[in-house]
């Protein structure tokens, strides 16, 4: 990815998805009526013209927001503490790796807009999730809907990371 982002970053992202899956507490079949359109900004992760700064900024903001969401008293009351601690640790490691890379990318002169724009968009998206949880009084089903939504958005974001990595491999081999 153009910096010393460890190869195991992708593995850590997959581990985060596995942990989020393991955190399930109730059957999602009980929660169908609580579905909500959080309007995940798909265009941010679906593009073919991927800039390193954009990809890293999206991943960084995504992980930062997930960390914040699952690092609250409400979250501690809702989830298994052992799994929550593992999630915090994994997210913290990934954030450290990404911060190192972002500093390098900015040093290489990539556009600041490519970094600030995704961050603002994702903050609005996560604010919608927080509002929903509050509206639903942090019910088990609300948390279950949020858990599945975050799994989906993280899956799409890590796919974007994989696409950039394979693009870099193709360029390196040509």
């Amino acid at each position: 990815l153009g910096c010393d982002l460890p190869q195991n970053h992708g593995l850590l992202s997959r581990n985060t998805l596995v942990l989020l899956h393991q955190m399930r507490r109730i059957s999602p079949f009980l929660c169908l009526k609580d579905r909500r359109d959080f309007r995940f900004p798909q265009e941010m992760v679906k593009g073919s013209q991927l800039q390193k700064a954009h990809v890293m900024s999206v991943l960084h903001e995504m992980l930062q927001q997930i960390f914040s969401l699952f690092h609250t008293e409400r979250s501690s009351a809702a989830w298994n503490m052992t799994l929550l601690d593992q999630l915090h640790t994994g997210l913290h490691q990934q954030l450290q790796h990404l911060e190192t890379c972002l500093l390098q990318v900015v040093g290489e002169g990539e556009s600041a807009g490519a970094i600030s724009s995704p961050a603002l968009t994702l903050r609005r998206y996560f604010q919608g999730i927080r509002v929903y949880l509050k509206e639903k009084k942090y019910s088990d089903c609300a948390w279950e809907v949020v858990r599945m939504e975050i799994m989906k958005s993280l899956f799409l974001s890590t796919n974007m990371q994989e696409r950039l990595r394979s693009k870099d491999r193709d360029l390196g081999s040509s």
Epitope: L32, K152, F155
Partner: antibody, heavy 121, light 107 residues
Framework: EVQLVQSGAEVKKPGESLKISCKGS????????IGWVRQMPGKGLEWMGI????????AYSPSFQGQVTISADKSISTAYLQWSSLKASDTAMYYC??????????????WGQGTLVTVSS | DIQMTQSPSSLSASVGDRVTITCRAS??????LNWYQQKPGKAPKLLIY???SLQSGVPSRFSGSGSGTDFTLTISSLQPEDFATYYC?????????FGQGTKVEIK
């Protein structure tokens, strides 16, 4: 390209067992639920049940609870619908379809081609 | 269970006609309503989801409206390929339920 491919038509006798399949490809199989829908000859659509392939959690329509079993093998991206003892009234076309779970996305956006099950003595 | 009632159960129309099919739920389901088209010997095809969102690849002559208990599928100008059976389905809660279908035939 997203595809759900179902196993072929079956002709069975009353009392026999049967397991039909639905193989998903072109998407993350564990990110979607798989539902099963029955259509008896000349009749409408009836929802039978659904499975979350990520952990094989299931939900059934009360009309089909105890009559059929839904299962999945995520290692081969395949969902199953099975009967332990078929009846003539099980004669129908059976469809599988994918469902986005709790995500806000189109329900049953992709369907299998259907498996015709004929039960006759 | 939530009962879904479609009307009419069948209708005859000509190419170019505006066709309206209604679906009523036995309790409020918000906008959790889908519409499918099925042709003989084929699997159903999703047309409209969440009451009014057009599924990708579906012609814009199809539209959906409604919320709560009353929903409508409209075909603005019927085409030869639109002669089929149409089903509504609630996705608000389990068990998921379908309407009994509306068969659109050539007049």
């Amino acid at each position: 390209e997203v595809q759900l491919v179902q196993s072929g038509a079956e002709v069975k006798k009353p009392g026999e067992s049967l397991k039909i399949s639905c193989k998903g490809s072109g998407y993350s199989f564990t990110s979607y639920w798989i539902g099963w829908v029955r259509q008896m000859p000349g009749k409408g659509l009836e929802w039978m049940g659904i499975i979350d392939p990520s952990d094989s959690d299931t939900a059934y329509s009360p009309s089909f609870q105890g009559q059929v079993t839904i299962s999945a093998d995520k290692s081969i991206s395949t969902a199953y619908l099975q009967w332990s003892s078929l009846k003539a009234s099980d004669t129908a076309m059976y469809y599988c379809a994918r469902h986005p779970g709790l995500n806000w996305a189109p329900d049953f956006d992709y369907w299998g081609q259907g498996t015709l099950v004929t039960v006759s003595s | 269970d939530i009962q879904m009632t479609q009307s009419p159960s069948s209708l005859s129309a000509s190419v170019g006609d505006r066709v309206t099919i209604t679906c009523r739920a036995s309790q409020s389901i918000g906008k959790s309503l889908n519409w499918y088209q099925q042709k003989p010997g084929k699997a159903p095809k999703l047309l409209i989801y969440f009451a009014s969102s057009l599924q990708s690849g579906v012609p814009s002559r199809f539209s959906g409206s409604g919320s709560g208990t009353d929903f409508t599928l409209t075909i603005s100008s019927l085409q030869p390929e639109d002669f089929a059976t149409y089903y509504c389905q609630q996705s608000y809660d389990f068990p998921l339920t379908f309407g009994q279908g509306t068969k659109v035939e050539i007049k």
